[in-house]
C-alpha cells in the first residue's frame, strides 16, 4: 500500500527484570525525513483530541528536550530508515505495546511492538533430533529468544549435572527478522548415555544461574549382554559337561530373539538364555558367544574359548622339503592334532629311534645320501600318548660320485688316429641321463657314456668327461698325449735387429712351435739346394747375391714339417750410376734431350741429384733430367746422385754435345 | 729480406701477348740456389705453375706443358728482374698473376709478390 | 702430370680445436711436398717445406707429415687468425702442381 509507512522489526521481543530490550528495526517514511518521533508505552487514540494518551518513554523534538526516562530509553536510529531502540535496564511493567509515533513534514504513522517481560529470567528450550541411536553423531540445540549488546548471556550444556566436555558453539542473532541466542552441541551418544538427564543452564557473564531446561535421552541401542559359563575357566575334558549362561544387561528397544554361535555360525534349536553341552568331544572345542536382537539390530556378547582336551591323534610327519639336495638344510615337523599341545615327541628314521630328538621339529643343517629314508613321530601330552602314523620319505639327490675318463686306445696316440673314451661312474640319484665332454668338438658318441675322436688332433692334449643328473659332475681331464710332427715351422732372422744392409753379419733361426716326440732334426735349403743342418744359418758378410729365397725343414720319428719360403733382402745403397742420354748423347739446339739415372739399388732410389760440368746442383729431383729447347751453351758433361736410405751413389760424367741447327748455320 | 715487385697492363686483348715483368730486391736473379717462377691463378684452374728460370752455370728454363708453345720467360741481369710473355691470350688465360722465388734445398715457393689481376677481354 | 687432391675441400671448426687436412698425391713424390696458407686478396704463404720442415716466423702449432703418396697438415689449436684456405704442392716432377685447396672457416 504506496499510503502505508513501510516498518521491519520483531513482531514480539523478550526479556525479564532487570535486564535490557534491543530492538532492532527499520523504516521507510512516505516522504521527506523524520521531524518528530515519540516512544509511547501502551498507547490509546483519543477522538476527541486526535492524539495518541498514554507513557512517554522517550520523546525527540524540535525544541530538543529530553525526558529523564531517555536516559533509560534510547533511539539509536536517523531520519529516514533506522528506526533501532535500546531499553536498558528493562522493568516488568515494561510489558506491552510499544508505540512508535513518527511525523515528518506532511505525513504521520503510529507502529507497534510487543514487549514480554517476565518477572524472573524464562527458561531455554532444547530441541532433540526425533531419533537417537547409539555411536551416530547428533546435534543438540538449546535456543533462548534473548539477546540483548548490554546484556551479556552464556548457554551451557551439562550430563546428569557434570559439565559436557564437548565443544559447544554459541550463536546470537539480533536482526530485524529475529532475536536469539542459540548453543548447538554436536554428541556421539553410547548405550550408556540412554536415561540420563541432559540440561542447558541459562548464565549471566558471571557464570550465576538464571535459568535451564532438562531432557532425558531415549538412546536406542542393541541388547548388551554378559555371558557366564560353568565351568568358569571354560576347560573340560571329553564326555564333561558345560552350561553357559546369557544375560542381558540393557536394550532398548525391548529384545526380540535369542540364539547361540560356535566359531560365527549359529547352533541351531538353542534359543533360549541358557546352552546345555552335555558329555562334549573335542569337535565341540571353539568359541562361543550368544546373540541377543532387538528393532536396532543384534548384540553379541564377549567370546568363550571352550577347550575339550584330549590325547594326540596318530600323527603325520611334514618334510620341508623333499626330495632333498645333498648338502641341503631339511626341516621335519611332526603334527598331531592334541589338546593340550604335546610335550614331549619322539622321532624315528627308518623305524630306529633317534636318539635324542624330542621336539616338534627337527632340524638336519646338511643332508647326506645316508639320511634317506622314512621318518616318522610319537606325540604325547597329561592325558597319554598318540600313535605312530605312516611317516614320510625323505629322498637325497646328489650328483654323480666318483667320474673317470678312461681311454680305450693302445698307446701312444698318434696325430690321426682314431682314440675311443667311456665316462664312468660310482653313483648317482637321479640317474645320470647324459654326459658331457671337454673339451668340444665334432666328435661322435657311438652309444651313452662313449666318445669317439676320429683323425685326432696334435693339441688334443686333454679330454674330460662329466656324468649328468639333474647336475654335472666332472672327471679329472686325461692326457691323450698326442704325438706329431714339428708344428709352425718358420725361418726368423735373429741378427741384424733391424733391416740387413751389404756387408752385415747374418743369422737365421729356423724355429717351429712344437713336437712331440721332442727330439729334432733341421735342414736348410736355397733355391733347391742344401745349406745346412743346424737350428741356425750364419753369414759373416752378407752380400746382395746372397738375397733370395730360403727355407727349413724340421723333422721327428712321426714327419717332416717345412717351413714357409722366406725372402732375404740385402739394402745397399745406390751402385752401378750412369747417365744415358735420349735421343742420345748429341743433339740438335732447339730440340729435346732427356738425361736419365740408371742405377742398381736396394730399396730403389728415393731422389736423383743433378749436377753440370761445375759440380753445380740442378734443381730437378726425378730420375730424368728434360731440357726442352735445349740450347747449344747446355753442351758439357753431367752427372748424377742416387739416393735411398742406404745411402748415396754417383755416376761418372756424361757428355752432352749440343751443336747449332742448319737454321743458325746458315744465319752466320 | 728478398722482396719481389710485378708490374704490367691489367686489361689484354684476346690474340695480343700479355707481358709482365718482377723486379727482384734483396737477392740476384743469377742466385746459384734459387729459381724464379710464374704462377697464376684463377677460379676454375686453381693454383697453376706455368714456368721457371735459373742459373746454375748457363741458363736454363722450365716451362708447364699447357702453355709450352706459347710461353717464354727471359731473365735481365742488368735490371736484375725477369719477365714473362704469353702469346695468343684467350680469356682463358684471365687470372691474378704471381712471381715466385723457389728456394734449395726443398724447392718450394718462399717469396711471392702481391700478385696482378689481368682480364684479357675485348 | 702428378693429381694433387685434398681432402677435406672445406672444414668448419672452433677456436680451440684440433684440425688435420690431407693431400694424397697421384704417384710417388718422396718428401719434395710444400704447404701453403692463403687468405682472401692475398698471395698464399709458405708454412712447410720437405712435407714437415716449418718455415722461420710459422707457429709451432702448425705441423706437417708423410712421405710417399699421403699427407697431413695438423693445426693442433686453431686460432682466431688461422680460417684461411690452405694448398699443398709437389715439388719432384714437372710440372709442379697444387691441390685444389682446403677452405677452413668459423663454425
Known amino acids: 500500500d504506496s499510503s502505508k509507512w513501510v516498518f521491519e522489526h520483531p513482531e514480539t521481543l523478550y526479556a525479564w527484570e532487570g535486564a535490557c530490550v534491543w530492538i532492532p528495526c527499520t523504516y521507510r517514511a512516505l516522504d521527506g525525513d523524520l521531524e518528530s518521533f515519540i516512544l509511547f508505552h501502551n498507547p490509546e487514540y483519543n477522538k476527541n483530541t486526535s492524539k495518541f494518551d498514554g507513557t512517554r518513554l522517550y520523546e525527540s523534538t524540535k525544541d530538543g528536550k529530553v525526558p529523564s526516562e531517555q536516559k533509560r530509553v534510547q533511539f539509536l536510529g536517523d531520519k529516514n530508515k533506522n528506526c533501532t531502540l535500546s531499553i536498558h535496564p528493562v522493568h516488568l511493567n515494561d510489558s506491552g505495546q510499544l508505540g512508535l509515533r513518527m511525523e515528518s513534514k506532511t505525513e504521520k504513522w503510529m507502529e507497534r511492538i510487543h514487549l514480554n517481560v517476565s518477572e524472573r529470567p524464562f527458561p531455554p528450550h532444547i530441541q532433540l533430533p526425533p531419533e537417537i541411536q547409539e555411536s551416530q553423531e547428533v546435534t543438540l540445540t538449546c535456543l533462548l529468544n534473548f539477546s540483548c549488546y548490554g546484556y551479556p548471556i552464556q548457554l551451557q550444556w551439562l550430563l546428569e549435572g557434570v559439565p559436557m566436555r564437548q565443544a559447544a558453539v554459541t550463536s546470537t542473532s539480533l536482526t530485524i527478522k529475529s532475536v536469539f541466542t542459540r548453543s548447538e552441541l554436536k554428541f556421539s551418544p553410547q548405550w550408556s548415555h540412554h536415561g540420563k538427564i541432559v540440561t542447558c543452564q541459562l548464565q549471566d557473564a558471571d557464570g550465576k544461574f538464571l535459568s535451564n531446561d532438562t531432557v532425558q535421552l531415549n538412546v536406542k541401542h542393541t541388547p548388551k549382554l554378559e555371558i557366564k559359563v560353568t565351568p568358569s575357566d571354560a576347560i573340560v575334558r571329553e564326555g564333561d559337561s558345560v552350561t553357559m549362561t546369557c544375560e542381558v544387561s540393557s536394550s532398548n528397544p525391548e529384545y526380540t530373539t535369542v540364539s547361540w554361535l560356535k566359531d560365527g555360525t549359529s547352533l541351531k534349536k538353542q534359543n533360549t538364555f541358557t546352552l546345555n553341552l552335555r558329555e562334549v568331544t573335542k569337535d565341540q572345542s571353539g568359541k562361543y558367544c550368544c546373540q541377543v536382537s532387538n528393532d536396532v539390530g543384534p548384540g553379541r556378547s564377549e567370546e568363550v574359548f571352550l577347550q575339550v582336551q584330549y590325547a594326540p591323534e596318530p600323527s603325520t610327519v611334514q618334510i620341508l622339503h623333499s626330495p632333498a639336495v645333498e648338502g641341503s638344510q631339511v626341516e621335519f615337523l611332526c603334527m598331531s592334532l592334541a589338546n593340550p599341545l604335546p610335550t614331549n615327541y619322539t622321532w624315528y628314521h627308518n623305524g630306529k629311534e633317534m636318539q635324542g630328538r624330542t621336539e616338534e621339529k627337527v632340524h638336519i643343517p646338511k643332508i647326506l645320501p645316508w639320511h634317506a629314508g622314512t621318518y616318522s613321530c610319537v606325540a604325547e601330552n597329561i592325558l597319554g600318548t598318540g600313535q605312530r602314523g605312516p611317516g614320510a620319505e625323505l629322498d637325497v639327490q646328489y650328483p654323480p660320485k666318483k667320474v673317470t675318463t678312461v681311454i680305450q686306445n693302445p698307446m701312444p696316440i698318434r696325430e690321426g688316429d682314431t682314440v675311443t673314451l667311456s665316462c664312468n661312474y660310482n653313483s648317482s640319484n637321479p640317474s645320470v641321463t647324459r654326459y658331457e665332454w671337454k673339451p668340444h668338438g665334432a666328435w661322435e658318441e657311438p652309444s651313452l657314456g662313449v666318445l669317439k675322436i676320429q683323425n685326432v688332433g696334435w693339441d688334443n692334449t686333454t679330454i674330460a668327461c662329466a656324468a649328468c643328473n639333474s647336475w654335472c659332475s666332472w672327471a679329472s681331464p686325461v692326457a691323450l698325449n698326442v704325438q706329431y710332427a714339428p708344428r709352425d715351422v718358420r725361418v726368423r732372422k735373429i741378427k741384424p735387429l733391424s733391416e740387413i744392409h751389404s756387408g752385415n753379419s747374418v743369422s737365421l733361426q729356423c724355429d717351429f712351435s712344437s713336437s712331440h716326440p721332442k727330439e729334432v732334426q733341421f735342414f736348410w735349403e736355397k733355391n733347391g739346394r742344401l745349406l745346412g743342418k743346424e737350428s741356425q744359418l750364419n753369414f759373416d758378410s752378407i752380400s746382395p747375391e746372397d738375397a733370395g729365397s730360403y727355407s727349413c725343414w724340421v723333422n721327428n720319428s712321426i714327419g717332416q714339417t717345412a717351413s714357409k719360403a722366406w725372402t732375404l733382402e740385402v739394402l745397399y745403397a745406390p751402385r752401378r750410376l750412369r747417365v744415358s742420354m735420349s735421343p742420345g748423347d748429341q743433339v740438335m739446339e732447339g730440340k729435346s734431350a732427356t738425361l736419365t739415372c740408371e742405377s742398381d739399388a736396394n730399396p730403389p732410389v728415393s731422389h736423383y741429384t743433378w749436377f753440370d760440368w761445375n759440380n753445380q746442383s740442378l734443381p730437378y729431383h726425378s730420375q730424368k733430367l728434360r731440357l726442352e729447347p735445349v740450347k747449344v751453351q747446355h753442351s758439357g758433361a753431367y752427372w748424377c746422385q742416387g739416393t735411398n736410405s742406404v745411402g748415396k751413389g754417383r755416376s761418372p760424367l756424361s757428355t752432352l754435345t749440343v751443336y747449332y741447327s742448319p737454321e743458325t748455320i746458315g744465319r752466320r | 729480406q728478398v722482396q719481389l715487385q710485378q708490374s704490367g697492363p691489367g686489361l689484354v686483348k684476346p690474340s695480343q701477348t700479355l707481358s709482365l715483368t718482377c723486379d727482384i730486391s734483396g737477392d740476384s736473379v743469377s742466385s746459384n740456389s734459387a729459381a724464379w717462377n710464374w704462377i697464376r691463378q684463377s677460379p676454375s684452374r686453381g693454383l697453376e705453375w706455368l714456368?721457371?728460370?735459373?742459373?746454375?752455370?748457363?741458363?736454363?728454363?722450365d716451362y708447364a706443358v699447357s702453355v709450352k708453345s706459347r710461353i717464354t720467360i727471359n731473365p735481365d741481369t742488368s735490371k736484375n728482374q725477369f719477365s714473362l710473355q704469353l702469346n695468343s691470350v684467350t680469356p682463358e688465360d684471365t687470372a691474378v698473376y704471381y712471381c715466385?722465388?723457389?728456394?734449395?734445398?726443398?724447392?718450394?715457393?718462399?717469396?711471392w709478390d702481391q700478385g696482378t689481376m689481368v682480364t684479357v677481354s675485348s | 702430370v702428378i693429381q694433387m687432391t685434398q681432402s677435406p675441400s672445406s672444414v668448419s671448426a672452433s677456436v680451440g680445436d684440433k684440425v688435420t687436412i690431407t693431400c694424397r698425391a697421384s704417384q710417388d713424390v718422396s718428401g719434395w711436398l710444400a704447404w701453403y696458407q692463403q687468405k682472401p686478396g692475398l698471395a698464399p704463404q709458405l708454412l712447410i717445406s720437405?712435407?714437415?720442415s716449418l718455415q722461420g716466423g710459422v707457429p709451432s702449432r702448425f705441423s706437417g707429415s708423410g712421405s710417399g703418396t699421403d699427407f697431413t697438415l695438423t693445426i693442433s689449436s686453431l686460432q682466431p687468425e688461422d680460417f684461411a684456405t690452405y694448398y699443398c704442392?709437389?715439388?719432384?716432377?714437372?710440372?709442379?702442381?697444387f691441390g685444389q685447396g682446403t677452405k677452413l672457416e668459423i663454425k
Open positions: 720437405g712435407a714437415s
Open positions: 714456368g721457371r728460370t735459373y742459373y746454375r752455370s748457363k741458363w736454363y728454363n
Open positions: 715466385a722465388q723457389e728456394i734449395e734445398p726443398h724447392d718450394a715457393f718462399d717469396i
Open positions: 704442392q709437389q715439388a719432384k716432377y714437372f710440372p709442379y702442381t
